[in-house]
């Protein structure tokens, strides 16, 4: 008789999840000399230990502490790029501007990027059929708690000027319910962070509005100011040219802007 299995609303664990995590860890540590000391088998064991045999709606930040400890990494605190709902452009940017880092440019972010995982209470099995959805099932699921944990730590590490890329095509350019809005904003340290600079990315040539005047951006400014951190905002009207100019900053077309 097949054993009854909890049916969750979200997609199941990404296929070949253990192999993917291990392979990503090996690749990352090969590319980043400062992380060559990391034992990837231990990293996988700690990752697995955070959710295997645990109820997938009962995961805590403490469950991930062994993994956090193994993945401890120092990135230049003044070169941090946060993002919300515009991951691809943020990653394209840091692939060119190699001295800036998104969370997914760190080992732990790289390991988990675009992956889903969960286990089952009292069994060592990984659930490849379904995992809890943050809205429909529960917020304390393995994936959500992981990103909340690493995002909090990433924001806490930031200093000086912190940049955030926001999607100007969304109805809520700044969304209080996003990871940026609910976790990162509140964990920037006013003693270390002087300014949060928002880059509002326009969706196309059709939009000539000053999106820095958007009510949700004003809301972000208010939250940040109340935390004694300065706020600045720039419209990026041309994300295509923005990337081109990151690659070729010396071009007169990139330096001629007022």
């Amino acid at each position: 008789v097949p054993r009854w299995r909890q049916q969750w609303s979200g997609p199941g664990t990404t296929k070949r999840f253990p192999e993917t995590v291990l392979a990503r860890c090996v690749k990352y540590t090969e590319i980043h000399p400062e992380m060559r000391h990391v034992d990837c088998q231990s990293v996988w064991d700690a990752f697995k230990g955070a959710f295997i045999s645990k109820h997938p709606c009962n995961i805590t930040e403490e469950d991930y502490q062994p993994l956090m400890k193994l993945g401890t990494q120092t990135v230049p605190c003044n070169k941090i790029l946060l993002w919300s709902r515009i991951k691809d452009l943020a990653h394209q940017f840091t692939q060119v501007q190699r001295d800036m880092f998104t969370l997914e440019d760190t080992l732990l972010g790289y390991l988990a990027d675009d992956l889903t995982w969960c286990g089952e209470f009292n069994t060592s099995k990984i659930n490849y059929q379904s995992c809890p959805d943050w809205r429909k099932d529960c917020s304390n699921n393995p994936v959500s708690v992981f990103w909340k944990t690493v995002s909090r730590r990433f924001a806490e590490a930031a200093c000086d000027v912190v940049h955030v890329m926001l999607n100007g095509s969304r109805s809520k350019i700044f969304d209080k319910n996003s990871t940026f809005g609910s976790v990162e904003v509140h964990n920037l340290q006013p003693e270390k962070v002087q300014t949060l600079e928002a880059w509002v990315i326009h969706g196309g040539r059709e939009d000539s509005r000053d999106l820095c005047q958007d009510p949700t951006i004003k809301e972000l400014e208010s939250i940040i100011s109340k935390r004694n951190i300065q706020f600045s905002c720039k419209n990026i009207y041309r994300p295509d040219k923005f990337l081109q100019c990151v690659k070729n900053p010396e071009d007169s077309s990139c330096t001629s802007e007022i």
Epitope: R205, D210, I236, Q244, S252, S253, C254, E257
Partner: antibody, heavy 123, light 107 residues
Framework: EVQLLESGGGLVQPGGSLRLSCAAS????????MSWVRQAPGKGLEWVST????????YYADSVKGRFTISRDNSKNTLYLQMNSLRAEDTAVYYC????????????????WGQGTLVTVSS | EIVMTQSPATLSVSPGERATLSCRAS??????LAWYQQKPGQAPRLLIY???TRATGIPARFSGSGSGTEFTLTISSLQSEDFAVYYC?????????FGQGTKVEIK
Amino acid sequence: EVQLLESGGGLVQPGGSLRLSCAASGFTFSFYDMSWVRQAPGKGLEWVSTITLHGGDTYYADSVKGRFTISRDNSKNTLYLQMNSLRAEDTAVYYCARDPSYIYSTSGYFDYWGQGTLVTVSS
Amino acid sequence: EIVMTQSPATLSVSPGERATLSCRASQSVSSNLAWYQQKPGQAPRLLIYGASTRATGIPARFSGSGSGTEFTLTISSLQSEDFAVYYCQQYNNWPWTFGQGTKVEIK
């Protein structure tokens, strides 16, 4: 020095086709949106079409939509306008123009213009 | 589409005098407005963008003002080379549109 040189104009019968070219020099062509603007004899200026840096997006005036196609070859620093199903009202001097394509401020005006090429549609 | 209306159609001014050209948009274009000068047989030349910013190499006697729907181009002291046709253009909304032009002629 920025230079834009149009070519390809001439006399064509109604319903006919013509392809205009604009050779650009003196700047990094692939960093700028480019446009065509026309001016009928003795009349004002009319924006015709715009193409973004890499040709990913194109925009047309309603009067030419479905008949004209703007394109570019960044390796040749050249802008094109393929004009099909030409009408008498398309008779004009066609200017190639550069948009400054700013990142941090909106643009959509023309900082450099070619000298134009005359297209005459007549039977 | 946004209709741009320029007035007057023709402006007769003596050299050395001040010329004031108007441009009205059928709906707000914010500050996304440019002014061009065109002389017979020549291509247009950009004078002003962003409603009030002078383009590179444009003399200080040319100034632009306004926002929303009402805009003005002022030539403080007309020189002989300033007699030409002037066009305004909005770039706030597609399609981009030009005014019909104001001809500044010698009085």
